[in-house]
């Protein structure tokens, strides 16, 4: 079983970053950390999408990784997509320092995110609390600014 993974985020614009993943035990939480730069100040949706396909850019990654066929939610919600990691927060300089611990994603098994795509979005994720159908699917987080396939790290 892989215990470490990494993702290099790139897009058409200025947004780029490196995100690391570590899971010390197969059923334990995954630590997610790293930095993303080139963002506008504020919150940006942060999700693992289903496919590790970036052939046509970030749109090829498909919808949120959702093997349990649940509604979109926030990372602390029981009802959420596996890939729902909430929001990252960019400062005035456009830098988001990411530090997340999540117990739903995994680096092995049915919830394995390796080989899938990590995406940072244009807008804040409303965590499934909004008033339209899209809120229950994507959180209205808007376009995909940057993405990368999550790979095994040594």
């Amino acid at each position: 079983m892989a215990t470490k993974a990494v993702c290099v985020l790139k897009g058409d614009g200025p947004v780029q970053g490196i995100i690391n993943f570590e899971q010390k035990e197969s059923n334990g939480p995954v630590k997610v950390w790293g930095s993303i730069k080139g963002l506008t100040e504020g919150l940006h949706g942060f999700h693992v999408h289903e496919f590790g396909d970036n052939t046509a850019g970030c749109t090829s990654a498909g919808p949120h990784f959702n093997p349990l066929s649940r509604k979109h939610g926030g990372p602390k919600d029981e009802e959420r997509h596996v890939g729902d990691l909430g929001n990252v927060t960019a400062d005035k300089d456009g830098v988001a320092d990411v530090s997340i611990e999540d117990s739903v994603i995994s680096l092995s098994g049915d919830h394995c995110i390796i080989g899938r795509t990590l995406v940072v979005h244009e807008k804040a994720d409303d965590l499934g609390k909004g008033g339209n159908e899209e809120s229950t699917k994507t959180g209205n987080a808007g376009s995909r600014l940057a993405c990368g396939v999550i790979g095994i790290a040594q």
Epitope: E41, D126, K129, G130, G131, G142
Partner: antibody
Framework: EVQLVESGGGLVQPGGSLRLSCAAS????????MSWVRQAPGKGLEWVAN????????DYVDSVKGRFTISRDNAKNSLYLQMNSLRAEDTAVYYC?????????WGQGTLVTVSS | VIWMTQSPSLLSASTGDRVTISCRMS??????LAWYQQKPGKAPELLIY???TLQSGVPSRFSGSGSGTDFTLTISSLQSEDFATYYC?????????FGQGTKLEIK
């Protein structure tokens, strides 16, 4: 077509109680957070309370905490607001709306008047 | 609590005019902002959410912009049915609050 229809408003004395209902149709009610928003006569809008799609979480504006209770029955596609210990300042049109933090379709509203 | 200042409170304009309504926050709210229109005796209707996303069925003459603490609703060419009261609303932090409203009246 999404429809939200409120009922249960009326005239009540200070200290009294009322239960508002909202009947929802035209969408999968159990998939959405829902809210109550009120508007005092001639005034602006005030969010009152919300409830998660499965009823497991609720939030309230401070001014109604401990007096109002939001609930839902997904089998009946219905949202409720139990209002106790009513005060004159609770006088308003109460709207049911889809969404927990921002609000898509709204109902037509039901008027609650608290007066002796 | 996030305090919101919506301006102007009253706006007089003519059909065909381009008008803007401003909403300023006491702190940054990212993209957690919505706009609503309300006509007398009617329920509010959602126009825009997430700062700039137009609700389905809302005419394209309505647009939203801004970031951080300063946001704007623009109507590019006023139609007679646009004379109403407009509210901004933040959903960044609890309690979710509305601006005090802007009444758009016929000049």
């Amino acid at each position: 077509e999404v429809q939200l229809v409120e009922s249960g408003g009326g005239l009540v004395q200070p200290g009294g109680s009322l239960r508002l209902s909202c009947a929802a149709s035209g969408f999968t009610f159990s998939s959405f957070w829902m809210s109550w928003v009120r508007q005092a006569p001639g005034k602006g809008l005030e969010w009152v309370a919300n409830i998660k799609h499965d009823g497991s979480e609720q939030d309230y504006v401070d001014s109604v905490k401990g007096r109002f209770t939001i609930s839902r029955d997904n089998a009946k596609n219905s949202l409720y607001l139990q209002m106790n210990s009513l005060r004159a300042e609770d006088t308003a049109v109460y709207y049911c709306a889809r969404g927990g933090i921002w609000f898509g379709p709204w109902g037509q509203g039901t008027l609650v008047t608290v007066s002796s | 609590v996030i305090w919101m200042t919506q301006s102007p409170s009253l706006l007089s304009a003519s059909t065909g005019d381009r008008v803007t309504i401003s909403c300023r926050m006491s702190q940054g709210i990212s993209s957690y902002l919505a706009w609503y229109q309300q006509k007398p005796g009617k329920a509010p209707e959602l126009l825009i959410y997430a700062v700039s996303t137009l609700q389905s069925g809302v005419p394209s003459r309505f647009s939203g912009s801004g970031s951080g603490t300063d946001f704007t609703l623009t109507i590019s060419s006023l139609q007679s049915e646009d004379f109403a009261t407009y509210y901004c609303q933040q959903y960044y932090s609890f309690p979710y609050t509305f601006g005090q409203g802007t009444k758009l009246e016929i000049k």
